[in-house]
């Protein structure tokens, strides 16, 4: 009876279990009743990082110097290239696909410490009573407007991203 499931590092095809190709190799042909799975090593600047049945290897990532990127770790047949940013610049994400001089703080966050040549911007969440409605690399959280000092009342509460809205007091006739 043909199998319905295969062991680890195997795959089911044409009612039989074939061996997966090891990392660094791609599939050329599936196994048969009489032959083993045929695999081939990935070419230069290619990789596969898992046991697989891929017919094409993945291209190594290109660390584009026009984006401020450079190679941190050269790729192998089993691993992708790892990019990092030029000295003094910061990756915009874990994947490091682009570089910024320093990060900015999103709305709801204020700048705790402005970036220097050796450290990135440090952001902090705006506490109750403060807000930031902009992305900035230098602006701190701003205090909510004090309606009372303007002889007004709060018409709309503030948040970490918005100021309070003040309005006239209801006058008793």
């Amino acid at each position: 009876e043909p199998p319905t499931a295969c062991r680890e590092k195997q795959y089911l095809i044409n009612s039989q279990c074939c061996s997966l190709c090891q990392p660094g190799q791609k599939l050329v042909s599936d196994c048969t009743e009489f032959t083993e799975t045929e695999c081939l090593p990935c070419g230069e600047s290619e990789f596969l990082d898992t046991w697989n049945r891929e017919t094409h290897c993945h291209q190594h990532k290109y660390c584009d110097p026009n984006l401020g990127l450079r190679v941190q770790q050269k790729g192998t047949s089993e691993t992708d290239t790892i990019c990092t940013c030029e000295e003094g610049w910061h990756c915009t994400s874990e994947a490091c696909e682009s570089c910024v001089l320093h990060r900015s703080c999103s709305p709801g966050f204020g700048v705790k410490q402005i970036a220097t040549g050796v450290s990135d911007t440090i952001c902090e969440p705006c506490p109750v009573g403060f807000f930031s409605n902009v992305s900035s690399a230098f602006e701190k959280c701003h205090p909510w407007t004090s309606c009372e000092t303007k002889d007004l009342v709060v018409q709309q509460a503030g948040t970490n991203k918005t100021d309070v809205v003040c309005g006239p007091q209801d006058r008793l006739r």
Epitope: S98, A137, E139
Partner: nanobody
């Protein structure tokens, strides 16, 4: 495509003044916080000054406070840096930059040399 074109640099004696300009195109200038950043020969990038989109709030590094003034004209898509009481240590290439400071969005800079 974002373009930032700095101008106004040159050779000036200590104590002198210069006004740098940065002409911006390829983005909505009035929506962006803008910065002046400089790089002295053989040194890293130093954040000099910043201004919010409306031009109402500014930041200055301690090294230039009281001597430099940042401003912007949103109708002309231009950023300025007025530099007074220049010192030898202000010698650098000056760049303008927009949030979020992508590497590829930087201009060529303008060289300021303070020397007698």
């Amino acid at each position: 495509e974002v373009q930032l074109l700095e101008s106004g640099g040159g050779l000036v004696q200590p104590g002198g003044s210069l006004r740098l300009s940065c002409a911006a195109s390829g983005f909505t200038f009035r929506d962006y916080e803008m910065w002046w950043v400089r790089q002295a020969p053989g040194k890293g990038l130093e954040r000099v000054s910043a201004i919010n989109p409306q031009g109402t709030r500014t930041y200055y590094a301690d090294s230039v406070k009281g001597r430099f003034t940042i401003s912007r004209d949103n109708s002309k898509n231009t950023l300025y840096l007025q530099m007074n009481s220049l010192r030898a240590e202000d010698t650098a290439v000056y760049y303008c930059a927009k949030l979020p400071f992508f590497f590829e969005e930087w201009g060529q800079g303008t060289l300021v040399t303070v020397s007698s």
